[in-house]
C-alpha cells in the first residue's frame, strides 16, 4: 500500500492551526488509518486541539489547532491492511514562534526628570534585533547620550523631558526569516505642578463690604487640580456660598465681605499624578478706626483738673489726636517728652496720655475758655474717625467792653457790657450807686442779649457824661466793670504827604489825623483851587476807602495849571480843622489814559472773580470804554469784553477749577489805548457740590 501525507512537511507559527491529509493508494479494503504523535502515542479521534478525522477508506486528516511549541516533532500516519500489513508515512511538523510583542503597553507614563525605561518585551523563536525609533529616526543615531537601549532591549531615557514626549516605535527584526514587526508606544511625560501666588501678602480692609481675590498660578501636566486651605483647614465651596467663590479652575479664591476673621494664612495646593506643590498667601485685614467711647464732662473754673477720654478700635492700632474748634492740641509743640505716651503742652495746661487704644486729655487749672467742643480723631493708614465731646465749665461772670465811650450832646450812644458767664448771669447798671433806669435818668434805656447788655444813653447835658457801672451775678459769683462816657471832639487835621499830578487828575497822599476826637472818622473833604482863583472846589471821600491806601484823587483839573489842595476830616461831632494847603502843577495833555489799577475779589463759589477797575488819569479826554481779555494760563484767550466807561468792575464767571488765570485791561479814550493793566489769580479746587453760575458781567 502506498501512503502519502500532504503536505509532506509542515511549519506552523505558534498559535496558528494547520491540517495534514494522509492518503492511501491501493485496493486493499478494510484498511485502518491511524495517526501517532511525536512521542509515539496514538492520537484518538474527536480531540479538540489535535484532532484526527477519518474521511473515508482511503484518507484521514490530522488538524493541529492553535499550535504550541510542544506540538513539534514527527507525526506518523500508519495504515494497516486486513492482512495485518502496515504502511506508514511521516511528516516533520516544525513549530516556530513568530516575532510578537508580549509586554509593550501603550501609553507609558513617566514623571519629568526621572530616568524613564520604555518597556518592550518581544517573543520569537530566533533572537531578534530590536531598533527603537522616534519621529522616524533610530534614537541611537540621535547621538543624545540620554538615550540608551538596555541589554533587555528596553529603551532608557535619562532625565526625561517634556519635549521627549511622543510616539516611540519598538521594531524587531529576524534576518534569517526576513521577519519584521513593530509596536508604536505612546510616551507621556507628566510634569509635577509648580505653583506661585500672585502676591504673597494681600492687604484688605474690613467692614467695607468689599471682596478680596487671592490668586495662584499653577502649571504642570496633566493640568493640576487646585484646592485651598485656611489656617490648615480645607475650604469647601457650598452652593450659594455667602463667603467663598472659586473660579472655574479654582486658581482664584474670592472672599466676600471681608472682615477681621478672614485674616489668616491661605495655602493654595496644586496636584496632579506627578506630584503636588503649594504656595502660601498671608491675608492681612486692616480695619478703619472706630471711636468706641467718649464722655462729656462738667467742671468748675479753677478746679484742679478734668480728664476727657477717647477709646478707639482699628487695625493697625489707631493713633488718637485731640483738637478743639480753634486749637490743634496734638500738633502743637510739646514740652519735655517723658515717655512717648505722655505729651504736655508748652504752657503745661494740657496733658495727653495715650496707651494702646485709649487716649485721655487732662486739662489743669481749668479756665472758662476751656469750655466747648473737644474732638478726638483716631487715625490709621486705612482711615479715620472723629467724635466730639463737650466740656462744660461753670464760672463767675467776666465782663468786658470799651471802657471809654465817646459821644456828644444829643447823640445817642450804646455802652456795651459784654458778659461771659455760666450759668448765665443777671446784669444791672448803676450810676452813682443808683440802679438804672430810674426816674432821674429818663434819657437811658437798657437792652439785654444772652452775651451782652447795652446801656443806651442820649446825653442832653454835661451831667450825663461820667461813670456808669455794669454788674453781673450768677450762682458762682459776681463781677463789676466801670465805664466812662466821654465828651467827643472833632478830629485834628490830616497832613498831606505828597501830590502826584497828571494832566486832568491828581492823587493826594495823606496821613490820617493824629486825633480822631474819640469817634470814628466818617469822611474826608478835599478842597482845591487854581492859584489865583478865589473859590475852592470840594469833594467828599468815604473814610474807609480813602484810608485803605491813604490816597484821594481829585478830578476835572486843567492841564499845566498850578493848584492848591487841602484836606479836612469829618467825624460824628463835626468837621475838624483843615490842613495847610499844598501846591502842585498838573502835567500837559498826555493823550492816552493811564492803565486802570486792578484788584480781584474771589467769589464765594470759588470759580468766579470780581475784578475791580480803579480808574486812573484819563489823559485829558474822557474814557470811552475798557477792554478786557482773559484766559487760563497756557489755554486759549476768551473773547474780548468791552465795558462802558462808568464800569468799576468786571465779573468773570464759570472759570475752570484750580486754574491760574491772567486778565488784561486797557482804558481807551479818543486819543488811544492805555498800556495794559495785568492781574493774575488762581481759582479754588473743585468742591463736591457745585454752585450754579453764569457768564461774565460788568458793573
Amino acid at each position: 500500500l502506498q501512503v502519502d501525507i500532504v503536505p509532506s512537511q509542515g511549519e506552523i507559527s505558534v498559535g496558528e492551526s494547520k491540517f495534514f491529509l494522509c492518503q492511501v493508494a491501493g485496493d486493499a479494503k478494510d484498511k485502518d488509518i491511524s495517526w501517532f504523535s511525536p512521542n509515539g502515542e496514538k492520537l484518538t479521534p474527536n480531540q479538540q486541539r489535535i484532532s484526527v478525522v477519518w474521511n473515508d477508506d482511503s484518507s484521514s486528516t490530522l488538524t493541529i489547532y492553535n499550535a504550541n511549541i510542544d506540538d513539534a516533532g514527527i507525526y506518523k500516519c500508519v495504515v494497516t491492511g486486513e492482512d495485518g500489513s502496515e504502511s506508514e508515512a511521516t511528516v516533520n511538523v516544525k513549530i516556530f514562534q513568530k516575532l510578537m510583542f508580549k509586554n509593550a503597553p501603550t501609553p507609558q507614563e513617566f514623571r519629568e526628570g526621572e530616568d524613564a525605561v520604555i518597556v518592550c518585551d518581544v517573543v520569537s523563536s530566533l533572537p531578534p534585533t530590536i531598533i527603537w525609533k522616534h519621529k522616524g529616526r533610530d534614537v541611537i543615531l540621535k547621538k543624545d547620550v540620554r538615550f540608551i537601549v538596555l541589554s533587555n532591549n528596553y529603551l532608557q531615557i535619562r532625565g526625561i523631558k517634556k519635549t521627549d514626549e511622543g510616539t516611540y516605535r519598538c521594531e524587531g527584526r529576524i534576518l534569517a526569516r526576513g521577519e519584521i514587526n513593530f509596536k508604536d508606544i505612546q510616551v507621556i511625560v507628566n510634569v509635577p505642578p509648580t505653583i506661585q501666588a500672585r502676591q504673597n501678602i494681600v492687604n484688605a480692609t474690613a467692614n467695607l463690604g468689599q471682596s478680596v481675590t487671592l490668586v495662584c498660578d499653577a502649571e504642570g501636566f496633566p493640568e493640576p487640580t487646585m484646592s485651598w486651605t485656611k489656617d490648615g483647614e480645607q475650604i469647601e465651596q457650598e452652593e450659594d456660598d455667602e463667603k467663598y467663590i472659586f473660579s472655574d479652575d479654582s486658581s482664584q479664591l474670592t472672599i466676600k465681605k471681608v472682615d477681621k476673621n478672614d485674616e489668616a494664612e491661605y495655602i493654595c495646593i496644586a496636584e496632579n499624578k506627578a506630584g503636588e506643590q503649594d504656595a502660601t498667601i498671608h491675608l492681612k485685614v486692616f480695619a478703619k478706626p472706630k471711636i468706641t467711647y467718649v464722655e462729656n464732662q462738667t467742671a468748675m473754673e479753677l478746679e484742679e483738673q478734668v480728664t476727657l477720654t477717647c477709646e478707639a478700635s482699628g487695625d493697625p492700632i489707631p493713633s488718637i489726636t485731640w483738637r478743639t474748634s480753634t486749637r490743634n492740641i496734638s500738633s502743637e509743640e510739646k514740652a519735655s517728652w517723658t515717655r512717648p505716651e505722655k505729651q504736655e503742652t508748652l504752657d503745661g495746661h494740657m496733658v495727653v496720655r495715650s496707651h494702646a487704644r485709649v487716649s485721655s486729655l487732662t486739662l489743669k487749672s481749668i479756665q472758662y475758655t476751656d469750655a466747648g467742643e473737644y474732638i478726638c480723631t483716631a487715625s490709621n493708614t486705612i482711615g479715620q474717625d472723629s467724635q466730639s465731646m463737650y466740656l462744660e465749665v461753670q464760672y463767675a461772670p467776666k465782663l468786658q467792653g470799651p471802657v471809654a465811650v465817646y459821644t456828644w450832646e444829643g447823640n445817642q450812644v450804646n455802652i456795651t457790657c459784654e458778659v461771659f458767664a455760666y450759668p448765665s448771669a443777671t446784669i444791672s447798671w448803676f450810676r452813682d450807686g443808683q440802679l438804672l433806669p430810674s426816674s432821674n435818668y429818663s434819657n437811658i434805656k437798657i437792652y439785654n442779649t444772652p452775651s451782652a447788655s447795652y446801656l443806651e444813653v442820649t446825653p442832653d447835658s454835661e451831667n450825663d457824661f461820667g461813670n456808669y457801672n455794669c454788674t453781673a451775678v450768677n450762682r458762682i459769683g459776681q463781677e463789676s466793670l466801670e465805664f466812662i462816657l466821654v465828651q467827643a471832639d472833632t478830629p485834628s487835621s490830616p497832613s498831606i504827604d505828597q501830590v502826584e499830578p497828571y494832566s486832568s487828575t491828581a492823587q493826594v497822599q495823606f496821613d490820617e489825623p493824629e486825633a480822631t476826637g474819640g469817634v470814628p472818622i466818617l469822611k474826608y473833604k478835599a478842597e482845591w483851587r487854581a492859584v489865583g482863583e478865589e473859590v475852592w472846589h470840594s469833594k467828599w471821600y468815604d473814610a474807609k476807602e480813602a484810608s485803605m491806601e491813604g490816597i484821594v484823587t481829585i478830578v476835572g483839573l486843567k492841564p499845566e495849571t498850578t493848584y492848591a489842595v487841602r484836606l479836612a476830616a469829618l467825624n460824628g461831632k463835626g468837621l475838624g480843622e483843615i490842613s495847610a494847603a499844598s501846591e502842585f502843577k498838573t502835567q500837559p495833555v498826555q493823550g492816552e489814559p493811564s492803565a486802570p489799577k486792578l484788584e480781584g475779589q474771589m467769589g464765594e463759589d470759588g470759580n468766579s472773580i470780581k475784578v475791580n477797575l480803579i480808574k486812573q488819569d484819563d489823559g485829558g479826554s474822557p474814557i470811552r470804554h475798557y477792554l478786557v481779555r482773559y484766559r487760563a494760563l497756557s489755554s486759549e484767550w476768551k473773547p474780548e469784553i468791552r465795558l462802558p466807561s462808568g464800569s468799576d468792575h468786571v465779573m468773570l464767571k464759570s472759570l475752570d477749577w484750580n486754574a491760574e488765570y491772567e486778565v488784561y485791561v486797557v482804558a481807551e479814550n479818543q486819543q488811544g489805548k492805555s498800556k495794559a493793566a495785568h492781574f493774575v489769580f488762581r481759582t479754588s479746587a473743585q468742591p463736591t457740590a457745585i454752585p450754579a453760575n453764569g457768564s461774565p458781567t460788568s458793573g
Epitope: 497756557s634 486759549e636 495785568h678
Partner: antibody, heavy 124, light 107 residues
Framework: QVQLQQSGPGLVKPSQTLSLTCAIS??????????WNWIRQSPSRGLEWLGR?????????DYAVSVKSRITINPDTSKNQFSLQLNSVTPEDTAVYYC??????????????WGQGTMVTVSS | EIVMTQSPGTLSLSPGERATLSCRAS???????LAWYQQKPGLAPRLLIY???LRATDIPDRFSGSGSGTAFTLTISRLEPEDFAVYYC????????FGQGTKVEIK
C-alpha cells in the same frame, strides 16, 4: 525801538539738537505783557508756530502739539534773551526759524516784532 | 488745532487795482484774535492788521481788514508796486496757526 537778534548754527546733523538764541533789546524778557515766540517756515509746512515763553509772576511755556515732546524754550533774564532747543532733529526740521514778540502791552497781541530769521539745514 | 485756509493761492493784478484776499477758519475765531501779515522774499513777515481790522503802526490806510466767525477778508484798495508780496492770515486766540498764504503778483 524793540529789536530781536537771532544767533545759532545753520547746519545740524540728524538726531542731534538744534539750538538758537534770540537777544531782545528795547523790551524785557520778564515783561508781564509780552510773550516770546519761536516760529519756523518751510516750503512743505508754511509758517508754523513752535512755542512761547512768558513771565506772569512765574515762568510759563506753551508748545505746539507737533513738537511738544522735543522742544524746550528757556528765558535768560541775565542776558535778556530766550533760546530754542529742538531735540532729535530730522531733515523734516529744515526751515527758516524766526523769533517773535507777542505784544500785549500795546493791545496788539499778534507778532509785532520779528527776528531776522535763521536758515537751519538738517543734513549729515 | 484751528486750521486757516486762504484763497486764492495766487492773485494776479495790476498796480492801482483792488485786491481782496480771503481767509477761512475751521472753527469760529474771535475777531479780537485775527491778524494779517505781509512777507517779501528773504524777509521776516511784517504785521499789517490785528484784531481783524486794526492797522499796525506805520501801515498805510489802503490796507483794511474785516470779517467775523470763520470768514475774514484783507482788502488792499489800490495796489502800489511795493504791495506785491505773499500775505498770511493768523489766529492767535488759541495755539497760533497761520494760513498757507496768498501770493499777490503783478499781472
Amino acid at each position: 525801538q524793540v529789536q530781536l537778534q537771532q544767533s545759532g548754527p545753520g547746519l545740524v546733523k540728524p538726531s542731534q539738537t538744534l539750538s538758537l538764541t534770540c537777544a531782545i533789546s528795547g523790551d524785557s524778557v520778564s515783561s508781564n505783557s509780552a510773550a516770546w515766540n519761536w516760529i519756523r517756515q518751510s516750503p512743505s509746512r508754511g509758517l508754523e508756530w513752535l512755542g512761547r515763553t512768558y513771565y506772569r509772576s512765574k515762568w510759563y511755556n506753551d508748545y505746539a502739539v507737533s513738537v511738544k515732546s522735543r522742544i524746550t524754550i528757556n528765558p535768560d533774564t541775565s542776558k535778556n534773551q530766550f533760546s530754542l532747543q529742538l531735540n532729535s532733529v530730522t531733515p523734516e526740521d529744515t526751515a527758516v526759524y524766526y523769533c517773535a514778540r507777542e505784544n500785549i502791552a500795546a493791545w496788539t497781541w499778534a507778532f509785532d516784532i520779528w527776528g531776522q530769521g535763521t536758515m537751519v539745514t538738517v543734513s549729515s | 488745532e484751528i486750521v486757516m485756509t486762504q484763497s486764492p493761492g495766487t492773485l494776479s493784478l495790476s498796480p492801482g487795482e483792488r485786491a481782496t484776499l480771503s481767509c477761512r477758519a475751521s472753527q469760529s475765531v474771535s475777531s479780537s484774535y485775527l491778524a494779517w501779515y505781509q512777507q517779501k522774499p528773504g524777509l521776516a513777515p511784517r504785521l499789517l492788521i490785528y484784531d481783524t481790522s486794526l492797522r499796525a503802526t506805520d501801515i498805510p490806510d489802503r490796507f483794511s481788514g474785516s470779517g467775523s466767525g470763520t470768514a475774514f477778508t484783507l482788502t488792499i484798495s489800490r495796489l502800489e508796486p511795493e504791495d506785491f508780496a505773499v500775505y498770511y492770515c493768523q489766529q492767535y486766540g488759541s495755539s497760533p496757526t497761520f494760513g498757507q498764504g496768498t501770493k499777490v503778483e503783478i499781472k
